[in-house]
Interface confidence: medium
């Protein structure tokens, strides 16, 4: 054993050595290497990249690196029968067709296997009909259409702009409204920042650029054919009719040049207000159908994509812990991309690669982490978080007993303005302390800490002098670890200024123009933001794997529980009469939160005072910290969402990307005034308050003295 292994002390210089070993130039080199050809899930190119990463991680010094394969449902366009949308005249002649592919970016004209824009898992179909413009296709947009404007989408093809919410929620909402097809498009209002040129001259979306993406509503299920279990060699697969989360109507994405041609002819109702207008020179009429001169013309979709069971490959690397090898800290990010993956995911994968290299360098010098670190390169994230979910399903018994933390590592940048962190409250103090030790890469903050620039640019809404940290939602590979298994999770990346740039995500997201050059020319020429993200992600992993006492502060959970209880109570108090009529009380929840606060405070005091040289007591206290997140898991899951089991957080039912607090109560209260049976609806609210109060109380008791 090395001297570090023989003692329980991790010298501070090891963290410094780890961070100092991370190099921007390496991240740049890795990003270039990962982005020269497409790495679509299920393709030979992505299998070859998996093997390359396996080989390099072994060279870097990991103890073992294995491929874990699964056979999952994926979706591809038909190579000989392309997808498109037409405007047809009364004779059925196609008088306009949308483009079949994006014009390739300079230098990539001869690259083969660029998958054309498509909505993954769309069923086949050729619906034709009148168009209805549904804004962002959010729940509230359909409420506005159906309830206020009395516009019926049944039997119509709807056109929705991308942005605000996950595209799968848009499709689900359209289905529920009775639509027979969905056209998704990128409006310049959301994907073209003023004053910036289109790619290749800037980072804006050109008119021919299109966002790909899956349109599933999996609710955490993983492979649609094997929910709850790994898609292994002896898996029992559901029939396609019983598959989880597949859309039932054809869906297709287009760019704003093609959208202009469809929207400029729209007639019917005017947009209800300015929030329904984008930036195209069209009236943004809602429809249904085209205006006067064009009223006999219809829209027709031609969708021929196929769903196929296909093999995918995760790469799993292990760096065995010296003291607690049965405690796992996981760093994972995906490898598969829609096309080149310049930002998503390879800006993240390049950072993971450099973190592995740095850890490997320390290991070659005789160092080991206290706990085991697992590194993962996930496959098929873009098709519904499939690689991570299947692996977690296969290893769930190990993970629920041994999983300390999961740090996600998708795109390292979505802008270059400031840090963005979403994580469990248990990690707030870890993130604060770490960022105080790191240098800010921001202009104007030379010699200042990352914490300072972050706090200045993204202040907490509640706590003066602290940065904003957001709730975890979903739409990325932490989902199964946090929402299903209850493993403390976090993610970090550099982001844009959300105050000044209200466009959704980054403009070139999931388009062919997401290239190495996009990053190197426009986002991060010096790769200093990538390096900072590597330091944050790597630093979190280092501390989680190496701290003698786990760097979790349970008091921060107490603070947010009170905030979330206040919030959900205030939502319920919009209905004071019904609360009185049905005897709805939040007393049990507030009481449980109070108990949690007191017990967490006492636990924290004991944590300061206990004898850290006693390995049994140390392990006991660390286990209480590790299992606290697990204590918020309800084995029965949320109503109709069995794989979302965390009682405090779940992806919003209206937007998979966003996190909702006390989601069971929130969903029970949502639109309750429209429920046909108020007694039943308020009964469900009461049941959800009971579940939440019990869970918070039960979690609190896991922090009590054990005997």
């Amino acid at each position: 054993k090395s001297s570090n292994e023989a003692t329980n002390i991790t010298p501070k210089h090891n963290m410094k050595a780890f961070l100092d070993e991370l190099k921007a130039e390496n991240i740049k080199k890795f990003l270039y290497n990962f982005t020269q050809i497409p790495h679509l899930a299920g393709t030979e190119q992505n299998f070859q990249l998996a093997k390359q990463i396996q080989s390099q991680w072994k060279e870097f010094g990991l103890d073992s690196v294995e491929l874990a394969h699964y056979d999952v449902l994926l979706s591809y366009p038909n190579k000989t029968h392309p997808n498109y949308i037409s405007i047809i005249n009364e004779d059925g002649n196609e008088i306009f067709n949308t483009s079949l592919f994006e014009p390739p970016p300079p230098g990539y004209e001869n690259v083969s296997d660029i998958v054309p824009p498509f909505s993954a898992f769309s069923p086949q179909g050729m619906p034709e009909g009148d168009l209805v413009y549904v804004n962002y296709a959010r729940t509230e947009d359909f409420f506005k259409l159906e309830r206020d404007m009395k516009i019926n989408c049944s039997g119509k093809i709807v056109i929705a702009r991308y942005g605000k919410v996950f595209r799968g929620n848009k499709v689900k909402n359209a289905q529920l409204a009775g639509a027979k097809g969905v056209i998704l498009y990128s409006d310049p209002a959301d994907y073209f920042a003023p004053g910036v040129k289109s790619y290749p001259d800037g980072w804006n979306l050109p008119g021919g650029g299109v966002q790909r993406g899956n349109i599933l509503n999996l609710n955490g299920a993983g492979d649609p054919l094997t929910p709850g279990y790994p898609a292994n060699e002896y898996a029992y697969r559901r029939g396609i009719a019983e598959a989880v989360g597949l859309p039932s109507i054809p869906v297709h994405p287009i760019g704003y040049y093609d959208a202009q041609k469809l929207l400029e002819k729209m007639g019917g109702s005017a947009p209800p207000d300015s929030s329904w207008r984008g930036s195209l020179k069209v009236p943004y009429n809602v429809g249904p159908g085209f205006t006067g001169n064009f009223s006999t013309q219809k829209v027709k979709m031609h969708i021929h994509s196929t769903n196929e069971v296909t093999r995918i490959y995760n790469v799993i690397g292990t760096l065995r812990g010296a003291v607690e090898p049965d405690r796992y800290v996981i760093l994972g990010g995906h490898r598969d991309s829609w096309v080149f993956g310049g930002i998503d995911p390879q800006s993240g994968a390049a950072v993971v690669h450099e973190i592995v290299r740095s850890f490997g360098t320390l290991k070659k010098e005789g160092w080991r982490p206290r706990r085991t670190i697992l590194f993962a390169s996930w496959d098929a994230e873009e098709f519904g978080l499939l690689g991570s979910t299947e692996w977690a399903e296969e290893n769930s018994r190990l993970l629920q007993e041994r999983g300390v933390a999961y740090i996600n590592a998708d795109s390292s940048i979505e802008g270059n303005y400031t840090l963005r962190v979403d994580c469990t409250p248990l990690m707030y103090s870890l993130v604060h302390n770490l960022t105080k030790e790191l240098k800010s890469p921001d202009e104007g903050f030379e010699g200042k800490s990352l914490y300072e620039s972050w706090t200045k640019k993204s202040p907490s809404p509640e706590f003066s002098g602290m940065p904003r940290i957001s709730k975890l939602g979903s739409g990325n590979d932490f989902e199964v670890f946090f929402q299903r298994l209850g493993i403390a999770s976090g993610r970090a990346r550099y982001t844009k200024n959300w105050e000044t740039n209200k466009f959704s995500g980054y403009p070139l997201y999931h388009s062919v123009y997401e290239t190495y050059e996009l990053v190197e020319k426009f986002y991060d020429p010096m790769f200093k933001y990538h390096l900072t993200v590597a330091q944050v992600r790597g630093g979190m992993v280092f501390e989680l794997a190496n701290s003698i006492v786990l760097p979790f502060d349970c008091r921060d959970y107490a603070v947010v529980l009170r905030k979330y209880a206040d919030k959900i109570y205030s939502i319920s108090m919009k209905h004071p009469q019904e609360m009185k009529t049905y005897s709805v009380s939040f007393d049990s929840l507030f009481s449980a939160v109070k108990n949690f606060t007191e017990i967490a405070s006492k636990f924290s005091e004991r944590l300061q005072d206990f004898d850290k040289s006693n390995p049994i007591v140390l392990r006991m206290m660390n286990d209480q910290l590790m299992f606290l997140e697990r204590a918020f898991i309800d084995p029965l899951g949320l109503p109709d969402r069995p794989f979302y089991r965390h009682v405090i957080y779940a992806p919003s039912s209206h937007n998979k990307y966003a996190g909702e607090s006390f989601p069971g109560i929130y969903d029970a209260l949502f639109d309750i005034e429209s429920k046909v049976d108020p007694s039943k609806a308020w009964g469900e609210v009461k049941r959800q308050i009971y579940v939440a109060a019990f869970t918070v109380q039960a979690a609190a008791e896991t922090l009590s003295e054990v005997a």
């Epitope: 959300w498 939502i571 966003a658």
Partner: nanobody, 119 residues
Amino acid sequence: QVQLQESGPGLVKPSQTLSLTCTVSGGSISNSGYYWSWVRQHPGKGLEWIGFIYYNGSIHYNPSLKSRVTISVDTSKNQFSLKMSSVTAADTAVYYCARDGDDYGDYLRGQGTLVTVSS
């Protein structure tokens, strides 16, 4: 659906106090996890954050404007207000009120109102 509308005088004399009000419709200002902010955009420049008030009453200001700015809320009218004292020509800008939330991307802005500081 929540909408925000700014109102107030379009012309303010130098050294006087600028007063703007934001009326929120389609949702209550007080009973959710949102916070309500003021931002401004000088002609031909980017947006500048002025400050925000959280639903629980806590207020944060841009340090460079802190000494001149007051943000307040009137929950009974579903409005929040901005007062900026000792204005100069440099305060000429389009002023926006905005809503944000716990989550990134939960951003919603009013149409904006041009305020000119001139004698």
